[in-house]
Interface confidence: low
């Protein structure tokens, strides 16, 4: 675990779990990468979710200097998605199939976030927007968009942890 004072997380564990997250995110919606919803014209789901951006310290130099900035950003994103996957967007109708990987994905997001949460220290978590789809087809569309965004997010996170495991592990 990361601990107060800026010491490192268990990079190798984080790498393994983030790779598992990537696999789960793709298996949860394998067609996401082959479809284009731009004509939908309603991009706020992907705009209002966490993106890892240039100023977040997730580049090799930023990780070397102080990995806590990047890790906090990843932690915020994991909690954000964990809450979305536990919301009525995914629990409401139409019901997910019993063998859907979304449940496992949800648990793994929580697991990785706990690896990053410093013990005895509370990182601010973000308010989750009230996404209120009233129709089943709207829920399906939101699930699609959220999973697409999550795929991009965990792909970057996995690269961060791979770099950390290779270069920053004690």
């Amino acid at each position: 675990r990361a601990v107060p004072g800026g010491s490192s997380p268990a990079w190798t564990q984080c790498q393994q779990l983030s790779q598992k997250l990537c696999t789960l995110a793709w298996s949860a919606h394998p067609l996401v990468g082959h479809m284009d919803l731009r004509e939908e014209g309603d991009e706020e789901t992907t705009n209002d979710v966490p993106h890892i951006q240039c100023g977040d310290g997730c580049d090799p130099q930023g990780l070397r200097d102080n990995s806590q900035f990047c890790l906090q950003r990843i932690h915020q994103g994991l909690i954000f998605y964990e809450k979305l996957l536990g919301s009525d967007i995914f629990t409401g109708e139409p019901s997910l199939l019993p063998d859907s990987p979304v449940g496992q994905l949800h648990a793994s997001l929580l697991g990785l976030s706990q690896l990053l949460q410093p013990e005895g220290h509370h990182w601010e978590t973000q308010q989750i927007p009230s996404l209120s789809p009233s129709q089943p087809w709207q829920r399906l569309l939101l699930r699609f968009k959220i999973l697409r965004s999550l795929q991009a997010f965990v792909a970057v996170a996995a690269r961060v942890f791979a770099h950390g495991a290779a270069t920053l592990s004690p």
């Epitope: 706020e44 973000q126 927007p129």
Partner: nanobody, 128 residues
Framework: EVQLVESGGGVVQPGGSLRLSCAAS????????MGWFRQAPGKEREFVAR????????YYADSVKGRFTISRDNSKNTVYLQMNSLRPEDTALYYC?????????????????????WGQGTLVKVSS
């Protein structure tokens, strides 16, 4: 440059309702998240609500949750704030503002400095 004009303010009794509108000219609002803020006399400007481009991602200040509803009509280039169960402490000048960033920025939506275009404000007074 976008110009924002608020309307709909007025004097209302406690428990009453008002609907504020924010109309834009100069540029379409449909590509931007929009926020409502308020400033009571002698106090700092505070966040009230924010709505994303398409209108499904919405944030509220805790003090207005369950009473205020933010919405938008992109075809009319207008953002609304429906205010119900008004209280004396809701008395303030209400401003709408445009968020220039399409990206998630953590809690930045709470900060007035995150918004780049502002209206002149409309006054809401809740008094018996």
């Amino acid at each position: 440059e976008v110009q924002l004009v608020e309307s709909g303010g007025g004097v209302v009794q406690p428990g009453g309702s008002l609907r504020l509108s924010c109309a834009a000219s100069g540029r379409t609002l449909s590509s931007y998240a929009m926020g409502w803020f308020r400033q009571a006399p002698g106090k700092e400007r505070e966040f009230v609500a924010r709505i994303s481009q398409g209108g499904t991602a919405i944030y509220y200040a805790d003090s207005v949750k369950g009473r205020f509803t933010i919405s938008r009509d992109n075809s009319k280039n207008t953002v609304y704030l429906q205010m119900n169960s008004l209280r004396p402490e809701d008395t303030a000048l209400y401003y709408c503002a445009k968020d220039p960033s399409p990206y998630y920025r953590g809690s930045a939506y709470l900060l007035s400095g995150s918004y780049d275009s502002w209206g002149q404000g409309t006054l809401v007074k809740v008094s018996s």
